[in-house]
């Protein structure tokens, strides 16, 4: 029978009594930088390369005996969750393998960097069909390491990396903390995250998403024919490197953004257990677990977005806390959030031609998060419009004026400490779809974006109390692109979107004593691009 | 401009009679910075990746490494160039004292300098 | 092109030995073992093992075990398979062939074992 | 006796279909995904016509495919030709080893 990793990343239309999805990646090459592998082992002859590349350091210890066949361990394992013929995802895909980690699973920044560099220029030399690096390794935050992997994902080159083993901030470690690669966290059979003796899957803002990494069925270098189970981060990264090959194969223009937004858009969601993460790390933490799509092509037309999460403030007065979209994404929307409910909001600030968004802490807060909203919208023209606070009048309000330009997200932003001690009226932005409206304390940006048959529309639920959490979700169909609170009290947390639905996190009366006269309401703004829905109907 | 060592005009002398054109002195008000693994035994001391602006050549790479070098020597200290970078990153790994650190931060086209450090199969 | 070449036809006493050489060019050697395959005449084919010429390593079938030593000569790129204590049921054309997968093959050598 | 179960003989008129069986277990054909067929003519090393169940090697004509159900495997050719005639073997893997079928002889009518 099919093994529970194969049948987990498996849309149900594919299982039948074996695990044969179309295509097996065969337009596309994985290079996999790991231990010396055994090429010639049954599950796959002929489908490994392996390069002349060498770069690793002595083993530690005056006793130590290379024994091929542990020295070959990690690396034939991974290469057969990759492509191996009966336990592999991609079973098309071709692979190449360089060694950058000794018989000890040990490797260098320095050994690495020189490994991605040869890929680099073997790239140049042969120009062949997309490329995927699968990075199954840490080490400690680096600065070198992440910038390595920044140039070559630039380059148009798709890495996945293991978000480490150390049940851990995956931010700490590298590459799992560099932005352009595609981070991966290991789930069990029963969807938890996995544990690994005392420690186990890292976690946090860094991961992308999670894949099956325990009890993995692979090849095992003790013999031609053995299989063995093991478990890792690394086994998680060779699944979802597996599924991007074959995503690739069927479409190989697909750049690493829309690799990566389509990754998390068919991922499961919400199937992880938080629990097993530390309190502060779950909000940060994607609940998704990699899954291939349910067909090859086809998922053009959709909207997609992605919640990208800033580091952390800090604690200081004027600490701000900046998040990012990728090059090739547009920065919808803009939210912030903290757990003491201190903060000043948060604005969206052109930086270096690029829109960010940056959040801000207030004076007695313990740091903030700067929430974007990253989505792919072709041909998009987006710009910002802000209203200073209105002071006097019921509060401040900012609309999309140009013709033809949508509202995609709010933001609201203040100077005073504490906007709770000056309770505005709630303010309804009733049959007024293209204006934000808040605080009379705050400046308002509302993100207006011209693309080719975009529409949005939004959405609002609100509850007589603050009761800890508030949200609202998109139908079928509509995407979520904006998130934020209605009206900007301390009792509000922040908002943030977690797939499509829009959380508005405040402080539970019980706890601060407030009277229940305030509501808190939860807007999303859901937009859906007819554009690209009718260029996908046209090509079908 | 002067070069903050002493050592620049001499090892001007030394690179005229190696190659063309003067060896560039460090831009003033852009300090290299130094990095290494906040993870202590996963450290690699004595192996540092020096890391050049965006724009440098590998020529001007080549270059660096070898004033390094003779910096170095003059010091006396033996240092070894393990791999010069380009295609990626411009920069060089070398095999060095960490004494020299301070002098290798102020050599020209130098963004930042980093501690070789260990990675793990996870 | 991929190619397997093996040696010339032998003829055996029972009891004896026979050495059977494949010598492979034209593709990574290490990417892909040998395998050895046998067919009497008249008959079926019959795996008889498999070689890495990455490491040495082999897998002989259950039936040979004991009989079969394959080896390789990695600096000639050459493949050797030894059958031992000949019977006249080993008579047979002996075939390597590339990898598991078998997807090149030996033009095959034949060894008849006859007193 | 051969592990995996061929039928001795098939036959067809040129321009026909025909498909031959291969009969194994879930120990071998139903439990791995490297099911492969051979071509031999008489006096010719075995030629690889079908890997992993269905795949085709380049230079091999598309009037070969191959299937899986369960614990059986089937190779079929269309369009017979007289160049087609010749013995025809299944293979898998099993545990540790390979097991091949005991071989079809198909014979193109002509």
């Known amino acids: 029978s099919i093994p529970w990793n194969l049948e987990r990343i498996t849309p149900p239309r594919y299982r039948a009594d074996e695990y044969q999805p179309p295509d097996g990646g065969s337009l596309v090459e994985v290079y996999l930088l790991d231990t010396s592998i055994q090429s010639d082992h049954r599950e796959i002859e002929g489908r490994v390369m392996v390069t002349d590349f060498e770069n690793v350091p002595e083993e530690d210890g005056t006793r130590f005996h290379r024994q091929a066949s542990k020295c070959d361990s990690h690396g034939t394992h991974l290469a057969g969750v990759v492509s191996g013929r009966d336990a592999g995802v991609a079973k098309g895909a071709s692979m190449r393998s360089l060694r950058v980690l000794n018989c000890q699973g040990k490797g260098t920044v320095s050994g690495t960097l020189i490994g991605l560099e040869f890929i680099r220029k073997s790239q140049l030399v042969q120009p062949v069909g997309p490329l995927v690096v699968l990075l199954p390794l840490a080490g400690g935050y680096s600065r070198v390491l992440n910038a390595a992997c920044q140039r070559l994902a630039r380059a148009g080159v798709v890495l996945v990396t293991a978000a480490g083993n150390f049940r851990d901030d995956a931010c700490l470690y590298s590459p799992a903390s560099a932005p352009e690669v595609i981070t991966v966290g290991a789930t069990n059979a029963q969807d938890q995250p996995v544990t690994l003796g005392t420690l186990g899957t890292n976690f946090g803002r860094c991961v992308d998403l999670f894949a099956p990494g325990e009890d993995i069925i692979g090849a095992s270098s003790d013999c031609s024919t053995c299989f063995v189970s093991q478990s890792g981060t690394s086994q998680a990264a060779a699944h979802v490197a597996g599924i991007a090959a074959m995503m690739l194969s069927a479409e190989p223009e697909l750049t690493l953004a829309e690799l990566r937004q389509r990754l998390i858009h068919f991922s499961a969601k919400d199937v992880i257990n938080e629990a097993w993460f530390p309190e502060d790390q779950r909000v940060l933490t994607p609940n998704l677990v990699a899954a291939l799509p349910p067909s090859t092509h086809g998922a053009g037309w959709q909207l997609f977005c992605r919640t990208v999460w800033s580091a952390h403030s800090g604690p200081t007065r004027m600490a701000t806390a900046i998040a990012r979209c990728a090059p090739d994404e547009e920065l919808l929307s803009c939210s912030s959030f903290s757990r003491s409910g201190k903060r000043r909001g948060e604005r969206m600030e052109a930086q270096g031609g690029k829109l960010v968004c940056r959040a801000h802490n207030a004076f007695g807060g313990e740091g903030v998060y700067a929430i974007a909203r990253c989505c792919l919208l072709p041909q998009a023209n987006c710009s910002v419009h802000t209203a200073p606070p209105a002071e006097a009048s019921m509060g401040t309000r900012v609309h999309c004026h140009q013709q033809g330009h949508v509202l995609t997200g709010c933001s609201s932003h203040w100077e005073v400490e504490d906007l709770g001690t000056h309770k505005p009226p709630v303010l309804r932005p009733r049959g007024q779809p293209n204006q934000c409206v808040g605080h009379r304390e705050a400046s308002i940006h509302a993100s207006c974006c011209h693309a080719p048959g975009l529409e949005c529309k939004v959405k609002e639920h609100g509850i007589p109390a603050p009761q800890g959490q508030v949200t609202v979700a998109c139908e079928e169909g509509w995407t979520l692109t904006g998130c934020s609170a209605l009206p900007g009290t301390s009792h509000v947390l922040g908002a943030y979107a977690v797939d499509n639905t829009c959380v508005v996190r405040s402080r539970d009366v019980s706890t601060t004593g407030s009277t229940s006269e305030e509501a808190v309401t939860a807007v999303a703004i859901c937009c859906r691009s007819r554009h690209l829905a009718q260029a996908s109907q046209e090509l079908q | 401009q002067e070069d903050e060592d002493g050592d620049y005009e001499e090892l001007v002398l030394a690179l005229r009679s190696e190659e063309d054109g003067l060896a560039e002195a460090p831009e003033h008000g852009t300090t290299a910075t130094f990095h290494r693994c906040a993870k202590d035994p996963w450290r690699l001391p004595g192996t540092y990746v020096v890391v050049l602006k965006e724009e440098t050549h590998l020529s001007q790479s080549e270059r660096t490494a070898r004033r390094l070098q003779a910096q170095a020597a003059r010091r006396g200290y033996l240092t070894k160039i393990l791999h010069v970078f380009h295609g990626l990153l411009p920069g060089f790994l070398v095999k060095m004292s960490g004494d020299l650190l301070e002098l290798a931060l102020k050599l020209p086209h130098v963004d930042y300098i980093e501690e070789d450090s260990s990675v793990f199969a996870q | 092109q991929v190619q397997l070449v093996q040696s010339g036809a032998e003829v055996k006493k029972p009891g004896a030995s026979v050495k059977v050489s494949c010598k492979a060019s034209?593709?990574?050697?290490?990417?892909?073992?040998i395998s050895w395959v046998r067919q009497a005449p008249g008959q079926g084919l019959e795996w008889m093992g498999w070689i890495s010429f990455y490491n040495g390593n082999t897998n002989y079938a259950q039936k040979v075990q004991g009989r079969v030593t394959m080896t390789t000569d990695t600096s000639t790129s050459t493949v050797y398979m030894e059958l031992r204590s000949l019977r006249s049921d080993d008579t047979a054309v002996y075939y390597c062939a590339r990898g598991y997968g078998m997807d090149v093959w030996g033009q095959g050598t034949t060894v008849t074992v006859s007193s | 006796q051969s592990a995996l179960t061929q039928p001795a003989s098939v036959s067809g008129s040129p321009g026909q279909s025909i498909t031959i069986s291969c009969t194994g277990t879930?120990?071998?054909?139903?439990?791995?995904?490297?099911v492969s067929w051979y071509q031999q003519h008489p006096g010719k090393p075995p030629k690889l016509m079908i890997y992993e169940v269905s795949n085709r090697p380049s230079g091999v004509s598309i009037r070969f495919s191959g299937s899986k159900s369960g614990n059986t495997a089937s190779l079929t050719i269309s369009g017979l030709q007289a160049e087609d005639e010749a013995d025809y073997f299944c293979?898998?893997?099993?545990?540790?080893?390979?097991?091949f079928g005991g071989g079809t002889k198909l014979t193109v009518l002509q």
């Open positions: 034209g593709y990574t050697l290490t990417s892909y073992g």
């Open positions: 879930s120990s071998d054909v139903g439990g791995y995904n490297s």
């Open positions: 293979s898998s893997y099993t545990s540790t080893s390979m097991v």
